[in-house]
């Protein structure tokens, strides 16, 4: 019995269906086929879980969190024992193993391994201002999404006709910050932060109001 090489990893957007491949070749009839799918969750590598089981011509549910979401892609028994997981969740990310036995066929490699990564688009970012908005001050524009896998990058732009940040601004696209030194009236206006990763984008708007000192009455 020989389980075929798997592609290594599967990526899927949260909520979509993942197909985890596993196929094998055997010299015996599929009368005593036994397939166990296990997962080593990324969030808890010490706690392997059963995903689905095929034994004695019957399918059995694995861990409760997979109930109603998992099945074999084809009619069993078969040499293609790939599974699907519907409505994927972040917690489904992990290393999946298919263990195949088909007595009396012994020997060979009977385990296939596939990694699953559930991707999450950036959640609506929060746009905030840190620091005094008084003329001549330094301010930091902050942009941060609570969710996003892979980790989002952040692009700030000023919504004026140049779409460029003020000349005194420095941007950190990883941290999502823009530092504007020595703010002036020209720093005022509407800014857009776009949080993006491989599967999506999300935006917030922020307006910076530079406060000019009131002329003192004599």
């Amino acid at each position: 019995l020989e389980v075929s090489e798997s592609p290594g990893s599967v990526q899927v957007a949260r909520g979509q269906t993942a197909v985890l491949p596993c196929a094998f070749s055997t010299s015996a009839a599929l009368l005593n086929l036994n397939v166990i799918w296990m997962v080593i969750p990324l969030s808890n590598a010490n706690q392997p879980e059963q995903v689905i089981l095929y034994q004695g011509g019957q399918m059995f549910d694995g861990a409760l969190r997979f109930h109603g979401r998992v099945g074999f892609t084809g009619t069993m028994p078969a040499t293609n024992v790939s599974i699907f997981i519907n409505n994927t969740q972040l917690s489904d990310t992990g290393t999946y193993q298919c263990l195949v036995n088909n007595l009396p066929d012994r020997g060979g490699r009977n385990i296939g391994v596939t990694g699953l990564t559930v991707l999450v688009p950036p959640s609506a970012p929060q746009c905030q201002i840190q620091g005094s908005q008084d003329l001549g001050s330094d301010v930091i524009l902050l942009c941060s999404s609570e969710e996003g896998i892979p980790r989002p990058t952040y692009l700030w732009e000023k919504l004026d006709n140049t779409l460029k940040l003020p000349p005194t601004a420095t941007q950190d696209q990883v941290q999502g910050t823009v530092t504007i030194r020595n703010i002036s009236a020209l720093s005022s206006g509407l800014y857009q932060c776009v949080a993006s990763n491989a599967i999506g984008t999300s935006t917030c708007l922020l307006d910076l109001q530079v406060i000019s000192p009131q002329p003192r009455s004599v």
Partner: antibody
Framework: EVQLLESGPGLVKPSQTLSLTCTVS??????????WSWIRQHPGKGLEWIGY???????YYNPSLKSRVTISVDTSKNQFSLKLSSVTAADTAVYYC?????????????WGQGTLVTVSS | QPGLTQPPSMSYGLGQTATLTCTGN????????AAWLQQHQGHPPKLLSY???NGPSGISERLSASRSGNTASLTISGLQPEDEADYYC???????????FGGGTKLTVL
């Protein structure tokens, strides 16, 4: 209560420049935090955002109209203005001035009554 | 060509509940939510709600706005004759970097 009022010629010849002014009362353009916009509505059709100006003079125009639009502000008169060059019959519309702010998530909470501009020779 | 899609017209009976829809994409409604405007014939638009179900003061409690995915909805319960108007949705489009509007829905109260 903030009020906006558009003024300007109702008839413009093709290839000329359309010029409109919006006078703001009941609030100061200079108070900051407001984005003073122009929006138009073609006869019997939907709305189209043209652009905005901030009290500091910073402008931002709809990319689809950018090459023909100029918006300016006169804080001493509490007015902002629109110029749209090289007009054609397709620019015939009711032109509104409007205000957007952070408090309404940058949507338009105050509108002028609108002025119909016809482009015709 | 409007950036958001609305049904051109809808008719409901007096006292019924109307649900108006507005469909965009992930760069506008899916990202930012939507605002709703009401326009009576010969009048400027009036802001009813923004960012899904926030609204200016003085707006009728018969109105309720929501969003599901890339579609925004405005529900008007207990329809009155004064609800007969054109309704527009609007959203900031982060890709176009512009405010976009729907083509409008003409609501008729029978």
């Amino acid at each position: 209560e903030v009020q906006l009022l558009e003024s300007g010629p109702g008839l413009v010849k093709p290839s000329q420049t359309l010029s409109l002014t919006c006078t703001v009362s009941g609030g100061s353009i200079s108070s900051g935090g407001y984005y003073w916009s122009w929006i138009r509505q073609h006869p019997g059709k939907g709305l189209e955002w043209i652009g905005y100006i901030y009290y500091s003079g910073s402008t931002y125009y709809n990319p689809s109209l950018k090459s023909r639009v100029t918006i300016s502000v006169d804080t001493s008169k509490n007015q902002f203005s629109l110029k749209l060059s090289s007009v054609t019959a397709a620019d015939t519309a009711v032109y509104y001035c409007a205000r957007a702010s952070r408090s309404t998530d940058y949507y338009f909470d105050y509108w002028g009554q609108g002025t119909l501009v016809t482009v015709s020779s | 060509q409007p950036g958001l899609t609305q049904p051109p017209s809808m008719s409901y009976g007096l006292g019924q509940t109307a649900t108006l829809t507005c469909t965009g994409n992930r760069n506008n409604i899916g990202d930012q939510g939507a605002a709703w405007l009401q326009q009576h014939q010969g009048h400027p638009p009036k802001l009813l709600s923004y960012r899904n179900n926030n609204g200016p003061s003085g707006i009728s409690e018969r109105l309720s706005a929501s969003r599901s995915g890339n579609t925004a909805s405005l529900t008007i319960s207990g329809l009155q004759p004064e609800d007969e108007a054109d309704y527009y949705c609007s959203a900031w489009d982060s890709s176009l970097r512009a405010w976009v509007f729907g083509g409008g829905t003409k609501l008729t109260v029978l």
